[in-house]
């Protein structure tokens, strides 16, 4: 006989993306004997919040706690009994509830204090919840990419852990109300905000990243919407044969249509807007959302705000995915180059309403959108970021890795699971049959 | 104010077809809006048909693709439905209606939900022989 | 197609009472927190009246006292103190995908 190591008992841990659309329930689990204060950590199971996202409930904060009730009672049976209490759950909200928060502070806190008092009722460790900053959002994403493509640390066939000769990957999120580029830089940054040092697995990383607050997707289309409404009477993008009854009311209630609110509008008119499908236009359109004009650094995206060139290869996930995906999967286009995505998008924004009913058969639903995603996911990449073809092939596309989520919050787990204590392995005598 | 009006046959045969006729009132049917044919079977709920666009494209229940046609008079302002090889089950009141996609916020994102806000009264279609 | 089930198929109550009518859809009819989901209001004779969008938006011209909720799928309609006008056949209507379909209908009769 001689020492064998007992399969190490599992621990949890639960993390509430309250994004600007709709919430997600996140639960983790590792093995508590964990490597170098990083526990190996994978996704145990996950569950979409019905409804809008917490911000939708400022008018109604219960209903935001409420909302969470039935991925929370998932939670009570995923999670095994004995590990309830030593189990950490946070939730963390991203821009929807940054632009509340500027908005109308009061509600903001409002709606928190009703999803704390609701998390709290549970037997879990609830450990907080609170507003994600953009750079904490853009930093845990590209934590997230690169732990689950072992970029940091990984377990050799010689039973040794090891650091990858391989470079960090880059990672672009695209949200509703947000969007943030992340990537590691070896020089410092020329603006400091938009830097970050980590120390991860003893190593040492300088990381640039920036949050662009209303330029999710859904901020995006509001704003071409709130455009298309001022320029043309009706919008470009839109497949022609679609029609719409827009209440202006929704279309400026947004902090980030407030600067196309025309000064004296009634909010509650009704206006008609019909699409036009017309590629050229609506590029243009997309153009209006990107200021090029100054820049008070060596070099800049977009908006005056400095970024590095981009290096390196890099992950772009969730809204960047959703719409590449529509475009290979249902439109069944190539976009393995800037030059075939900037094609799909127009091939996308040329089809009418009824062909693109044609070609997607049953989802009615924000299908007339897709055209503007794309246009506005090509133009971001290539003039914004100042992605060129070469840079463009080190991009992949993923919505998940090593069964996992990509997104910010999985690296803002691993972040607070340091605080968690690692039992000590088992060790039973017994026989090893291997 | 919108108003709608069918009008055709309250008898059709088996196998014939089914024709009948919605002349709108107060908005131009190429202005925008689509205008949909709904049905209710007797005593049952209602079974959405199809609808033509203000820019004359069709959209059909695929259940109904088959025998379905609706097409238009602009000159006469009307969209009219014609319904193939009827049997006794497509004995219903058959409506029709203005619908279109009402831009909603909700969550700082915006969406389009599909309502139909202008109807006709209805006009009854019994197929027997 | 998503097939919608409204319970009950018949509710008597009273007026001044609070009534409520519940739709089960066989697939969620929520894409991106949005909920495609509306509420018709049938008077015997007469066509339809849309009451309620989007789960929860009350259309121009309706009482408050008309309500819905829900998400996912599944969704009510609540009328808080019924009124005499109010007896008719409730349908509820999802729109997310094609082709949108209507449930069975609930009776409200007066008790």
């Known amino acids: 006989t001689r020492d064998v190591r007992e399969p190490p008992a599992l621990k949890y841990g639960i993390v509430l993306d309250a994004g600007s659309s709709h919430t997600s329930m996140f639960i983790y689990k590792w093995p508590a004997d964990k490597e170098n204060d990083t526990g190996i950590v994978g996704q145990h199971s996950s569950c979409d919040v019905p409804g809008g996202g917490i911000s939708s409930y400022a008018d109604n904060p219960s209903g935001a706690s409420q909302s969470l009730v039935g991925c929370l009672e998932q939670a009570l049976q995923d999670v095994p009994k004995e590990r309830h209490a030593g189990t950490p759950l946070y939730l963390g909200a991203t821009a929807g509830m940054r632009l509340l928060n500027l908005t109308n502070p009061e509600a903001s806190t409002s709606v928190l204090m009703a999803v704390t008092h609701t998390l709290t009722q549970y037997p879990f460790d609830f450990r907080g919840a609170r507003i994600l900053s953009g750079q904490e959002e853009g930093v845990f994403g590209w934590v997230t990419a690169n732990y689950l493509l072992e970029n940091f640390i990984k377990y050799g066939w010689v039973g040794r852990w090891f650091r990858p000769r391989k470079g960090t990957l880059g990672a672009m999120d695209l949200g509703g109300a947000s969007t943030q580029i992340t990537f590691e830089t070896t020089s410092p940054a020329e603006d400091r905000a938009s830097e970050v040092q980590l120390h991860l697995y003893g190593q040492h990383y300088r990381v640039y990243t920036h949050s662009f607050l209303c330029y999710g997707r859904d901020q995006v289309l509001q704003r071409l919407l709130a455009s298309a409404l001022q320029t043309h009477g009706f919008h470009p993008c839109w497949p022609r044969g679609f029609s719409t009854q827009v209440l202006l009311g929704d279309v400026y209630q947004s902090p980030c249509t407030m600067a196309q609110r025309p000064q004296n509008f009634n909010s509650s008119a009704r206006v008609s807007l019909s699409g036009s499908s017309d590629p050229h236009l609506c590029r243009d359109l997309v153009s209006g959302l990107f200021s090029f004009s100054s820049c008070p650094f060596s070099r800049c995206s977009f908006n005056g705000v400095f970024q590095p060139p981009v290096a390196g290869n890099f992950v772009a996930f969730s809204a960047f995915f959703y719409t590449v995906d529509f475009l290979r999967t249902s439109m069944g286009l190539p976009v393995a180059t800037l030059q075939q995505l900037e094609a799909a998008a127009v091939n996308v924004c040329n089809q009418t309403w009824a062909q693109l009913q044609a070609r997607v058969p049953g989802q009615r639903a924000r299908l007339a959108d897709y055209c503007a995603g794309a246009m506005f996911v090509q133009q971001l990449l290539s003039r914004g970021y100042g992605f060129d073809e070469r840079a463009f092939g080190g991009v992949i596309f993923q919505k998940k890795a090593a069964d996992t989520a990509v997104g910010w919050a999985l690296g803002y787990m691993l972040n607070l699971t340091n605080l968690i204590p690692a039992d000590p392995p088992g060790l039973r005598k017994g026989t090893d049959f291997s | 104010q919108v108003q709608l009006q069918e009008s055709g046959p309250g008898l059709v045969k088996p196998s014939q077809t089914l024709s009948l006729t919605c002349t709108v009132s107060g908005y131009s049917i190429t202005s925008g809006y689509y205008w949909n044919w709904i049905r209710q079977h007797p005593g049952k709920g209602l079974e959405w048909m199809g609808y033509?666009?203000?820019?004359?494209?069709?959209n059909y229940n695929p259940s109904l693709k088959n025998r379905i046609t609706i097409s238009r008079d602009t000159s006469k302002n009307q969209f009219s439905l014609k319904l193939s090889s009827v049997t006794a089950a497509d004995t219903a009141v058959y409506y029709c209606?203005?619908?279109?996609?009402?831009?909603?916020?909700?969550?700082?994102?915006?969406?389009?939900?599909?309502?139909?806000?202008?109807w006709g009264q209805g006009t009854t279609v019994t197929v027997s022989s | 197609d998503t097939q919608m089930t409204q319970s009950p198929s018949s509710l008597s109550v009273s007026v001044g009472d609070r009534a409520t009518i519940t739709c089960k859809a066989s697939q969620s009819v929520d894409y991106e927190g949005h909920s495609y989901m509306n509420w018709y209001q049938q008077k015997p004779g007469k066509a339809p009246k849309l009451l309620i969008y989007a789960a929860s938006n009350l259309e121009s011209g309706v009482p408050s006292r008309f309500s819905g909720s829900g998400s996912g799928t599944d969704f009510t309609l609540t009328i808080s103190s019924v009124q005499p006008e109010d007896f008719a056949t409730y349908y509820c209507q999802q729109s997310n995908e094609d082709p949108p379909t209507f449930g069975g209908g609930t009776k409200l009769e007066i008790k």
């Open positions: 209606a203005g619908g279109y996609y009402r831009y909603g916020l909700g969550s700082y994102s915006g969406s389009y939900y599909y309502v139909m806000d202008y």
């Open positions: 033509i666009s203000y820019d004359a494209d069709n």
